[in-house]
């Protein structure tokens, strides 16, 4: 039902859902810190623009009695319960920040008349694509899928002269929320990825994965998985791997690869890591000092959500436009705003664009090196290392099907 918004007369409120079930196991205190830091920046920016208004955040906590799994499995109802709480208290702000779980976002979007914008740090699944008033500030599954298809088809790079049309996907059900939805998108038979591939099989057991590594009758040399190097080691250990196997490790929210003096372990030599271009150092920031790299991205998305609201508020106020309108609710897309860590671009559907980075392990230096970057905004690949020191034969990525000649 329609809820009156605390969003006029020079006073603008942000409703922040503080859900027990979250895409990342982040103490709510850290998210509060991120939001508060964002508020300080927004107030400064509005003041500098000569806009004398008040911007505050209201943190809406769920009781945590019923929905206490801590992950996203029981988030569907928690989001709706929180919305009911907001509705009963008549405390809706100009914008809703949170939830981060795909289940809850999808359900909330479905079950409410959204005449206000919703900003999410998460909601990675395909079911949250193309939602008119939803903005997602962490790379959704659709962006990953488009990269993979682009990369599979590429055959004109010095280090990749074959297009690929096959893949195994390892998905055992214990994944983190981001990985769960990334792999879910690759698995879905109706997805773009599945549509563009000739062969794709999901490996669900550790043994299935381990057997493929040396199976002469395997149908593809390429295996996609999601997680960090430790996750791969737990699965693969020091097992021998056929020389033309390529493991694509999706580890988007982890900038440990970019830290000084990081050496790639030996088991990473057959692996290409897909991650995001790291932010400028956030370590000096009060909200991020005690966060792991992944959680830093999550907290940063909350902070950027506040900055995005500030950006839109400034534009609408400067133009003398009303904030509590469908126009405002639909405006959080197809734009670039100044985020905490540099410019942030949102696509036509309100999803964050980013630079994805594909890394390889140099056999010479045992260091991670950038092989190529991919700009999700223009769907374009930029090869970086034209002469990579790969483990694969002739320093070229192998064909995806053993024994098949050039195409």
């Amino acid at each position: 039902s329609q809820v009156s918004q605390n969003c006029h007369n020079g006073s603008y409120e942000i409703s922040v859902l503080m859900m027990g079930n979250s895409a990342f196991a982040e103490p709510l205190k850290n998210l509060e810190d991120a939001v508060n830091e964002g508020l300080e920046i927004v107030r400064g920016r509005l003041q500098n623009a000569g806009l004398n208004v008040t911007v505050n955040a209201t943190f809406m906590y769920s009781d945590g009695l019923i929905h206490n799994s801590g992950d996203c499995r029981s988030s569907t109802c928690e989001g709706l319960d929180l919305l009911r709480k907001i509705s009963n208290a008549q405390r809706m702000g100009c914008v809703l920040i949170g939830p981060s779980c795909t289940y809850s976002t999808f359900q909330m979007y479905l079950d409410t008349e959204l005449s206000y914008p919703m900003i999410s740090a998460g909601s990675f699944g395909l079911s949250c694509d193309y939602k008119e008033t939803l903005t997602r500030l962490m790379s959704p599954a659709r962006k990953l899928m488009y990269f993979l298809v682009n990369f599979w088809k590429t055959n004109d790079l010095p280090f990749k002269t074959y297009s690929w049309s096959t893949s195994y996907v390892y998905k055992n059900g214990t994944e983190t929320e981001d990985c769960f939805w990334y792999l879910n998108a690759l698995e879905a038979s109706v997805s773009y990825f599945s549509h563009e591939l000739g062969f794709k099989v999901v490996l669900r057991q550790d043994k299935e994965f381990q057997d493929i590594l040396m199976d002469h009758n395997r149908k593809s040399n390429v295996i996609i998985m999601c997680g960090g190097p430790e996750f791969l080691y737990k699965l693969k250990g020091d097992r021998a791997v056929a020389e033309d196997i390529v493991i694509i490790l999706v580890d988007l929210f982890n900038d440990q690869y970019f830290e000084d003096n990081v050496t790639a372990p030996d088991y990473m030599k057959n692996v290409l890591v897909l991650t995001l271009s790291p932010g400028n150092s956030l370590l000096n920031s009060s909200f991020s000092r005690n966060l792991s790299p992944t959680k830093r991205d999550f907290a940063l998305a909350y902070l950027n959500g506040i900055l995005l609201f500030g950006h839109m508020l400034k534009i609408f106020l400067e133009n003398g436009e009303n904030i509590t309108t469908p126009k405002f609710a639909h405006a959080f897309r197809n734009l670039t705003f100044e985020g905490y860590d540099g410019p942030v671009t949102l696509d036509d559907w309100g999803d964050v664009d980013s630079t994805m980075v594909l890394l390889y392990t140099s056999v010479d230096t045992k260091k991670y090196k950038v092989l190529l970057t991919y700009d999700t905004h223009v769907n374009k690949t930029y090869p970086v290392d034209m002469s990579p020191t790969f483990t694969w034969k002739n320093s070229k990525l192998p064909n995806d099907i053993t024994g098949r000649g050039p195409q």
Partner: antibody, heavy 121, light 112 residues
């Protein structure tokens, strides 16, 4: 305003090496790619290689692979280009240039003043 | 031999319009990569003139414009002035072994 200041002119013997520095001021050094571009007398611009300081590894044009080494010292906001096995055709003005973004495909929007390297016996 | 091909020289009288072409291939301009243009006066460092095919950095007069189509790009200068006499270079990205950053051979613009 961002500025790149390069080290002074060098005269070198064939077979030796030269190391040119490029100090950045007035910006976030790690956030931008640094490229090295050279220009022989009366000739055009030639990209030698570049580095992404936040990542630390360099990439080189095939022509210079094995002969050039590009490094960056984040603590002093300085990039270095070392060219070895010098020959007379390496006589040129060497420029460092900052990309408009982190990656090498960015435009080169800030240039150093250039360092003249003369290779002569 | 430069990866991107430019005419060695072009000329025009003051007030005229001149264009400088930059021809690439399917591995650079034709692959959709942006083209940037630089202006260089003798004895000085190059200066960014046009970026991302057709954008001007602040301070560059709107007499300078860029365009891109297929595997080539061009720089247009209208209302030619004596101070435009300089060398002009195009630059793009390249997917082949010659890459990743490639320049044109340069064009000397003479104002008659």
């Amino acid at each position: 305003e961002v500025q790149l200041v390069q080290s002074g002119a060098e005269v070198k013997k064939p077979g030796s090496s030269v190391r040119v520095s490029c100090k950045a001021s007035g910006g976030t050094f790690s956030s931008y790619a640094i490229s090295w571009v050279r220009q022989a007398p009366g000739q055009g611009l030639e990209w030698m290689g570049g580095i992404i300081p936040i990542f630390g590894t360099a990439n080189y044009a095939q022509k210079f692979q094995g002969r050039v080494t590009i490094t960056a010292d984040k603590s002093t906001s300085t990039a270095y280009m070392e060219l070895s096995s010098l020959r007379s055709e390496d006589t040129a003005v060497y420029y460092c240039a900052r990309g408009g973004g982190r990656w090498l495909h960015s435009r080169l929007d800030v240039w150093g003043q250039g360092t003249t390297v003369t290779v002569s016996s | 031999q430069s990866v991107l091909t430019q005419p060695p020289s072009v000329s025009g009288a003051p007030g005229q319009r001149v264009t400088i072409s930059c021809t690439g291939s399917s591995s650079n301009i034709g692959a959709g990569y942006d083209v940037h243009w630089y202006q260089q006066f003798p004895g000085t460092a190059p200066k960014l003139l046009i970026f991302g095919n057709n954008n001007r950095p602040s301070g560059v007069p709107d007499r300078f414009s860029g365009s891109k189509s297929g595997t080539s790009a061009s720089l247009a200068i209208t209302g030619l002035q004596a101070e435009d006499e300089a060398n002009y270079y195009c630059q793009s990205y390249d997917r082949s072994l010659s890459g990743p950053v490639v320049f044109g051979g340069g064009t000397k613009l003479t104002v008659l």
